[in-house]
């Protein structure tokens, strides 16, 4: 049994880091493998993560952490019974993938303005809370070409757009994702999408 693709890990910079790797053949990850992880700290102890299958030869493990600070560094040991398959380290602050925003809501009752709001996925005492910026994706269910991205570079988790920038009388969907420049993070996953029917009064044309 050998590791084909070494574990790579990303942290949500809150309580979970996710590590993925591939074995050289079909593996029952949860029965055959264990990933041991330990904070490099005098008084820390090793924790065991039981991996799950992620495709035939792929494994994924969700490492639980109390919290994360920038200085944290973890040692990782991948074991198959008594055999050490791989040894490495992981610094969560250097591999951050933020949590996805939630509670995306489209408010259509504000005159001819669409107000999209969502929730910051972090509590106020987390460092990322004040460092997230967002991308909002809006697309038409009827027309695949009607697909747009709005970059929200301010901290407030909301976006206002004129309803008239979208077509009237058809259904749209929206979703939002987050990233943090301070840690050069990857983008989060997209939030669940929300749907609404776009309708607005065409301005009266005078001839």
């Amino acid at each position: 049994m050998k590791v084909l693709q070494e574990p790579t890990c990303v942290s949500d910079y809150m309580s979970i880091s996710t590590c993925e790797w591939k074995m050289n053949g079909p593996t029952n990850c949860s029965t055959e493998l264990r990933l041991l992880y330990q904070l490099v700290f005098l008084l820390s102890e090793a924790h065991t993560c039981i991996p799950e299958n992620n495709g035939g030869a792929g494994c994924v493990c969700h490492l639980l952490m109390d919290d994360v600070v920038s200085a944290d560094n973890y040692t990782l040991d991948l074991w198959a019974g008594q055999q050490l398959l791989w040894k490495g380290s992981f610094k969560p602050s250097e591999h951050v993938k933020p949590r996805a925003p939630g509670n995306l809501t489209v408010h259509t009752n504000v005159s001819d303005t669409l107000l999209l709001t969502w929730s910051n996925p972090y509590p106020p005492d987390n460092y990322l809370y004040n460092h997230l910026t967002y991308a909002v994706n809006i697309w038409s269910e009827n027309d695949p070409a009607d697909f747009r991205i709005y970059n929200v570079t301010y901290l407030e988790p909301s976006l206002r757009i004129a309803a008239s920038t979208l077509k009237s009388g058809i259904s749209y969907r929206a979703r939002v994702r987050a990233w943090a420049q301070c840690y050069n993070t990857t983008w989060s996953e997209w939030s669940p999408s929300t749907k609404w029917h776009n309708s607005y009064r065409e301005p009266f044309e005078q001839h």
Partner: antibody, heavy 116, light 111 residues
């Protein structure tokens, strides 16, 4: 609410022994390393000893090595410090502290006086 | 003699910004991060800053920490009378397998 309550302090003669206890509540005791820190009257803080969450690893300051023993009972949510061969310079308020990278919660302390 | 050196005293007037330093000796390892504790008169110490610059919840943002090599500093802005206390720095010393604390700095708020 995290609470740490020390007990067992008192007056003891040089060469004598005392056992301090620290009752913990408000958090999962078995998941946290713990430590003892002391403060002699009018002096600064001095780290004494620390123990990992399972009790597998233990550390002592040079000044108490061989005389003091730290231990814990996770089933009772209690930390202990057995102090033997006590000296006058061990006179101090002894604080029990929870460890999360630093000493993030402290008890109110118990006074140990070593005097003849 | 502590491995971490702090000034024995510091002072400031209300509203001022005060900085307290904590210096490791030249041979002191710079891998560990620094923590700061506040001890108000007659009370147990309280964690103020951990991992160089992180504040536990409930600690006002008037308190901030920073680290440079083997030294650290604690800054208190908008000084208040209730900040009068002893302040200690500390760090885990992996070469000693233990925790080292500075000698403490007594902060006096004047006026």
């Amino acid at each position: 609410e995290v609470q740490l309550l020390e007990s067992g302090g008192g007056l003891v003669q040089p060469g004598g022994s005392l056992r301090l206890s620290c009752a913990a509540s408000g958090f999962t005791f078995s998941r946290h390393a713990m430590a003892w820190v002391r403060q002699a009257p009018g002096k600064g803080l001095e780290w004494v000893s620390a123990i990992t969450s399972s009790g597998r690893s233990i550390y002592y300051a040079d000044s108490v090595k061989g005389r003091f023993t730290i231990s814990r009972d996770n089933s009772k949510n209690t930390l202990y410090l057995q102090m033997n061969s006590l000296r006058a310079e061990d006179t101090a308020v002894y604080y029990c502290a929870r460890v999360h990278r630093a000493f993030d919660y402290w008890g109110q302390g118990t006074l140990v006086t070593v005097s003849s | 003699q502590s491995v971490l050196t702090q000034p024995p005293s510091a002072s400031g007037t209300p509203g001022q910004r005060v900085t307290i330093s904590c210096s490791g000796s030249p041979l002191f390892p710079d891998s560990g991060s620094f923590n700061w504790y506040q001890q108000l008169p007659g009370t147990a110490p309280k964690l103020l800053i951990y991992a160089d610059s992180h504040r536990p919840s409930g600690v006002p943002d008037r308190f901030s920490g920073s680290k440079s090599g083997t030294s650290a500093s604690l800054a208190i802005s908008g000084l208040r009378s209730e900040d009068e206390a002893d302040y200690y720095c500390g760090t885990w010393d992996y070469s000693l397998s233990g925790y080292v604390l500075g000698g403490g700095t007594k902060l006096t708020v004047l006026g």
